[in-house]
Interface confidence: low
């Protein structure tokens, strides 16, 4: 037989706390134990679960755990079943809630001298006792026309008066604990002797010299007083008006009228109502003077036919905010259609050429009206007046290519040369009418030119080929003065180009024929071995049939090219001593010698007392200093050629002689000793 060793028993439990219903069973065979709640099997959850044979509660819940629990033991082999005694919880709890109006039905019905009942929605088991508070101060029964019982959750105010106004809250406590109202109730019962607003003044905006009216009314029993003040607290009455409010009138109903308003009347007006009791009520309203600023200028607009475009009109700053509308040809635009106004925008849909013209944006308010025009151009695709033609241009002269077009607006013309955009410079110039000028035509200008004429509506283009008529010229012109080295082979070239290949020949300027050792080979003058007699003036003549002939004069000089007889050597000198850098050159014409020291030419007229260049070309530096160290270059030149050679100069401290060294010991390096 199945025997219950421990049976569950009814017990007190606290909401949200732990609890345990015990059940222990003894039986001959294996049994399984489960629990019933009001006859239905109990499913395990995290909150309520079987612990062995007992039922454990992690947190008692007054709603889910109310009812009768029973422990059931069953032998699945024999089918025998035993049930324990019933057990239930006496759950103690308390739960906060709001303070609500029970009577009358709505706040709007609360009047002075009516009964008001408030209810405290705090519930619990066992039944809690209640405490009421007004503005945080506890209320006790029988004081100041109210009824409250600690057992009752209701607070009755009979009759309710202004002195009962305040924030009502409640708290309740029981054996379980304490809770206070989750939402409180504000009771507001007006004192009829307090001033109340009936009509409040509103801000107004008026134009200069117009009139402004502020309305203001209060009510109370007995009737309240009403006073108007301006900005600086100056009272306004019909008897005493401040100097700047001479045109103010206060009416019996409290309204304030200001006539012929001026800028100094703008500001804050205060209407003050004062009842027999209670604080004054101060209402403020501002008088603004209407104003309107100027409108920004429009840039002219260019649109293309068939497109949709919008022009935004920025309204000027103003008070009140200006209204905006668009007009065209004196007619206000509609709010729909093909050309219409949308908000502040002018909308042109599917633009036609006839839409071009002046459109005006108007803005207006109480202060006045402003307007601004925008000029709208409807662009057309350019058409040709004169296309560029294939042209023959003469080398060295200015050349012109036309590109004359017409369109609205005036088209922009750009030129391309070999598909490369021509940027205007000293050689190219594009005139306003589109014509291209090539200032001085060169051979390589012979190529393809293309002009493109554009407006926002589209572009057209045409191209032309330029052929350059080449002039007869030396390429390059021979140098007018040339040198030949004595006793050596020499050549003097001369070449020319023209529309036809020119023939080239040399002759002596005096008309005499060339010696047999001098040959003229296709324009190159060749000297097999230069003699002194070969010096003189020669003329190169280039000619062809259509262009005639041209001449170039060349003066040939025979020279012995420069060689150095003496070259400067690497030199080391003691500080304070004298350095000598020798240099001697020969040649015909006799070469001149210049020195360059530390990257600058040494001007013989500006050398100073320490330096001197001798007639033979040598350079002497007295009293040398460390800063004189560096590379020195000897440059030899005449009218025919130039040569240079260089050597370093080192300036060193004179060593102090050691004991062991005799007076005749040589220095440790090659020195100039002076």
């Amino acid at each position: 037989a199945i025997v219950f060793i421990k049976q569950p028993s009814s017990q007190d439990a606290l909401q949200g706390r732990r609890a345990l219903l015990r059940c222990e069973v003894e039986a001959p065979g294996p049994v399984h134990v489960y629990w019933l709640l009001d006859g239905a099997p109990v499913q395990d959850t995290e909150r309520r679960f079987a612990q062995g044979s007992s039922l454990s509660f992690a947190a008692v819940d007054r709603l889910q755990d109310s009812g009768t629990f029973q422990c059931v033991a069953r032998d699945d082999v024999t089918g025998e079943e035993a049930r324990s005694a019933n057990a239930s919880f006496n759950i103690k709890w308390i739960e906060a809630g709001p303070v609500v109006l029970k009577h009358p039905a709505s706040e709007a019905e609360i009047q002075p001298q009516t009964q008001v009942t408030l209810r405290c929605h705090i519930d619990g088991h066992p039944r809690p006792t209640y405490q009421w508070f007004r503005d945080g101060t506890p209320l006790s029964d029988g004081q100041s026309n109210h009824t409250v019982s600690s057992k009752e959750r209701n607070l009755t105010l009979r009759p309710a008066g202004p002195e009962h106004s305040g924030l009502y809250s409640c708290c309740a406590h029981s054996a379980f604990g304490q809770a206070c109202s989750s939402q409180n109730f504000t009771l507001s019962i007006a004192d009829e002797s307090f001033a109340r607003v009936v009509l409040a003044p509103q801000d107004v905006v008026v134009a200069r010299y117009e009139e402004a009216m502020f309305h203001c009314q209060f009510s109370a029993q007995p009737p309240p007083s009403l006073q108007w003040l301006f900005e600086d607290e100056t009272p306004i009455t019909n008897r005493s008006r401040p100097p700047h409010l001479r045109r103010a009138t206060v009416f019996a109903n409290g309204s304030l009228l200001l006539t012929q308003v001026r800028p100094r009347n703008a500001g804050i007006y205060r209407c003050i109502g004062q009842g027999q009791r209670g604080p004054p009520i101060i209402l403020e309203a501002t008088l603004h003077l209407a104003e309107i600023e100027d409108m920004p200028l429009f840039e002219p607009r260019v649109f293309t036919a068939g497109s949709e475009e919008r022009v935004t009109c920025l309204p000027p700053k103003g008070l009140p905010e200006p209204s905006v509308w668009w007009e065209h040809a004196g007619v206000r635009l509609p709010t729909h259609g093909r050309v219409y106004q949308k908000g502040h925008e002018l909308v042109l849909a599917n633009i036609a050429e006839s839409d071009a013209g002046v459109y005006t944006c108007h803005a207006a308010n109480l202060a006045g009206q402003r307007r601004q025009d925008v000029n709208i151009t409807v662009a057309t695709v350019p058409s040709w007046l004169k296309k560029p033609q294939d042209s023959q241009l003469e080398e060295g002269k200015p050349g012109y290519l036309d590109c004359l077009t017409q369109a609205t607006p005036k088209p922009t013309v750009v030129w391309y040369r070999n598909q490369m955009l021509i940027s205007e410079d000293s050689r190219f110039e594009v005139f306003k009418n589109g014509t291209l000028r090539i200032n001085s035509v060169e051979v390589y200008d012979g190529t393809w030119y293309r002009c493109m004429s554009s407006t926002p509506a589209g572009s057209i283009e045409a191209q032309a080929r330029v052929q350059v008529l080449e002039k007869l010229k030396f390429t390059p012109p021979p140098q007018p003065q040339q040198c030949m080295e004595f006793d050596k082979e020499a050549t003097v070239p001369c070449s020319a180009t023209g529309r036809e290949k020119p023939t080239i020949k040399w002759e002596r300027a005096d008309g005499s024929s060339l010696p047999e050792w001098v040959t003229d080979n296709a324009g190159t003058l060749h000297f097999a071995r230069v003699t002194r007699d070969d010096a003189g003036n020669y003329t190169c003549i280039a000619s062809n049939g259509p262009q005639g002939q041209i001449r170039a004069h060349v003066q040939l000089t025979v020279a012995v090219f420069i060689t150095f007889k003496v070259e400067p050597e690497r030199t080391t000198v003691y500080q304070g001593h004298t350095a000598l850098l020798q240099c001697e050159a020969q040649g015909d014409p006799k070469p001149l010698i210049q020195w360059k020291g530390k990257d600058r030419i040494l001007d013989p007229t500006k050398l100073g007392p320490r330096m001197h260049i001798f007639q033979n070309g040598s350079l002497v530096i007295h009293d040398v200093a460390p800063e004189d160290s560096g590379r020195y270059t000897c440059i030899a030149g005449n009218s025919c050629n130039i040569k240079h050679t260089e050597a370093p100069l080192y300036v060193v401290d004179k060593p102090v002689p050691e004991e062991s060294e005799g007076p005749g010991s040589p220095p440790p390096y090659k020195m100039i000793q002076t």
Partner: antibody, heavy 119, light 108 residues
Framework: QVQLQESGPGLVKPSGTLSLTCAVS?????????WSWVRQPPGKGLEWIGE???????NYNPSLKSRVTISVDKSKNQFSLKLSSVTAADTAVYYC????????????WGQGTLVTVSS | EIVLTQSPATLSLSPGERAALSCRAS???????LAWYQQKPGQAPRLLIY???RRATGIPDRFSGSGSGTDFTLTISRLEPEDFAVYYC?????????FGQGTKVEIK
């Protein structure tokens, strides 16, 4: 005060046509306002679809222009949106809104209706 | 079309802090033609600011707008719990009307 209410099927098949209507209450569709459609794909931003005036004038977003038709029915005080050749990318909450008569901000808006494009 | 770029994409702040939301336009927008909207999950956008700086009816004065040209800012001086939402800027000065991609203001 003007209130707007969208209505129409919540599910449209791909390549089909999405059709929505916006009923205007508390004011006349013949006022000087323009009436717009705006959409918002799930978890994304807002995209303006187009607008209509009571005369029938329309403006559309160029990105949708080829597929959108907005019409107005003054007798019923409502305006409608048709979007053809829909794909899953057209799945969105569709809002109707009134544009301010002097400027073009949107206020008020309808509460929006979710349209899903799926087979 | 005018592209509006909002930054940051997300702003994590605590109630009581100040929020500054940026909206940058790809080309100049007249200040008369920029609006800000607030959108909470499952709701339609709500107009906050129009004309770049004018508060719509019933909008608390902790919301303010500023800016001109290509740079505009929406400032919330002290964040209240109900201000955590997504904010969009919109230009209505040229067609098509365009919106920014939104800035989400979330609780830190």
């Amino acid at each position: 005060q003007v209130q707007l209410q969208e209505s129409g099927p919540g599910l449209v098949k791909p390549s089909g046509t999405l059709s929505l209507t916006c009923a205007v209450s508390g004011g006349s569709i013949s006022s000087t306002n323009w009436w717009s459609w705006v959409r918002q794909p799930p978890g994304k931003g807002l995209e303006w679809i187009g607008e209509i005036y009571h005369s029938g004038s329309t403006n559309y977003n160029p990105s949708l222009k080829s597929r959108v038709t907005i019409s107005v029915d003054k007798s019923k005080n409502q305006f409608s949106l048709k979007l053809s050749s829909v794909t899953a990318a057209d799945t969105a909450v569709y809002y109707c809104a009134r544009e301010d008569s002097n400027y073009d901000w949107f206020d008020p808006w309808g509460q929006g209706t979710l349209v899903t494009v799926s087979s | 079309e005018i592209v509006l770029t909002q930054s940051p994409a997300t702003l994590s702040l605590s109630p009581g802090e100040r929020a500054a939301l940026s909206c940058r336009a790809s080309q100049s927008v007249s200040s008369s033609y920029l609006a800000w909207y607030q959108q909470k999950p499952g709701q339609a956008p709500r107009l906050l600011i129009y004309g770049a700086s004018r508060r719509a009816t019933g909008i608390p004065d902790r919301f303010s707008g500023s800016g001109s040209g290509t740079d505009f800012t929406l400032t919330i001086s002290r964040l209240e719990p109900e201000d955590f939402a997504v904010y969009y800027c919109q230009q209505y000065g040229s067609s098509p009307r365009t919106f920014g991609q939104g800035t989400k203001v979330e609780i830190k």
